[in-house]
């Protein structure tokens, strides 16, 4: 049985302040059952960036249609980037449970923010 892979193809992404950043993530399998969440940073202090089920993330939208069947693309787009958004973003697969259990993280994508061209 092949192990699930969480693939973040870009090690780094550079975006001008005010633009949108696309952070790519795909998974290799629909199972195990459980959600994908995005975080900035690692460890216990990490910041939740996107979780479709809970919270309000007005600047974050999924790249692919959230109603698409059996889709394995969990890329997100963050709008109106500011220098405060810089950091390393992780796409994380959870196994469904009570509570959900972290199963595997992508390697991370470092977002750097360039000054807005004058």
């Amino acid at each position: 049985e092949e192990e699930l892979q969480v693939i973040q193809p870009e090690k780094s992404v550079s975006v001008a302040a005010g633009d949108s950043a696309t952070l790519n993530c795909t998974v290799s399998s629909l199972i195990p059952v459980g959600p994908i969440q995005w975080f900035r940073g690692a460890g216990p202090g990490r910041e939740l960036i996107y979780n479709l089920k809970e919270g309000h993330f007005p600047r974050v939208t999924p790249v692919s249609d959230p109603t698409k069947r059996n889709n394995m693309d969990f890329s997100i787009r963050i709008s109106n980037i500011t220098p405060a958004d810089a950091g390393t973003y992780y796409c994380v697969k959870f196994r469904k449970g009570s509570p959900d259990v972290e199963l595997k993280s992508g390697a991370g994508t470092e977002l750097s923010v360039r000054a807005k061209p004058s």
């Epitope: 399998s29 629909l30 199972i31 195990p32 959230p66 109603t67 059996n70 889709n71 969990f74």
Partner: antibody, heavy 120, light 108 residues
């Protein structure tokens, strides 16, 4: 064409055991979660159990008595039912899960069901 | 556990008329709701998922609407083959997946 074919139903005494099978074809079985749903005579649908890869989920009403498993090499889903009770009498359907990417699962293909009757 | 309440339990409709079926969730399920049709002696068949998206091959007379806690399945002009029992199912918060008690659509 997706097909799901259940077998193994029958009449069993209370406290007895039964093993249901569901043979799947027409899709990449190992890539999808699969589920058992049952329907008591004249009643509505009741979710029983779901299996992903190693992950398994059960309704409280069957937890500790039923075990779901799969054999991807045989494209087959199983439900081992122990300590059966009269209230387990139902048609048992296997169903293929379909997922909306950021969300949960629903059931896009169903077998025709197999009847389990628990009676002395 | 999220409880789904379907109403009415039975709906008597003449062929060609419109049928409106309701499904109410005990808590917010966003759009994570499916509708199934079941005819006597047959397995359920998926009609609608994500509250409003018709499954491939389902006629356009079937439509789903609603979000949060209130959902509706509408059959715009009932055909003879549409007389059946209809179930809603939530997949927002599980286990357990839960189904409504069903609405039987019968010929008036």
């Amino acid at each position: 064409e997706v097909q799901l074919l259940e077998s193994g139903g029958g009449v069993v005494q209370p406290g007895g055991s039964l093993r249901l099978s569901c043979a799947a074809s027409g899709f990449s079985f190992s890539n999808f979660a699969v589920t058992w749903v049952r329907q008591a005579p004249g009643k509505g649908l009741e979710w029983v159990s779901t299996i992903g890869s190693g992950d398994t989920y059960y309704a409280d009403s069957v937890k500790g008595r039923f075990t779901i498993s799969r054999d991807n090499s045989k494209n087959t889903l199983y439900l081992q039912m122990n300590s059966l009770r009269a209230e387990d009498t139902a048609v048992y359907y296997c169903a293929k899960d379909s997922t909306v990417s950021w969300s949960g699962d629903f059931f896009d293909y169903w077998g025709q069901g197999t009847l389990v009757t628990v009676s002395s | 556990e999220i409880v789904l309440t379907q109403s009415p339990a039975t709906l008597s409709v003449s062929p060609g008329e419109r049928a409106t079926l309701s499904c109410r969730a005990s808590q917010n399920v966003k759009n994570d709701l499916a509708w199934y049709q079941q005819k006597p002696g047959q397995a359920p068949r998926l009609l609608i998922y994500a509250a409003r998206i018709r499954e491939t091959g389902i006629p356009a007379r079937f439509s789903g609407s609603g979000s949060g806690t209130e959902f509706t399945l509408t059959i715009s002009s009932l055909q003879s083959e549409d007389f059946a029992v209809y179930y809603c199912q939530q997949y927002y918060d599980w286990p357990p997946f839960t189904f409504g008690g069903g609405t039987k659509v019968e010929i008036k």
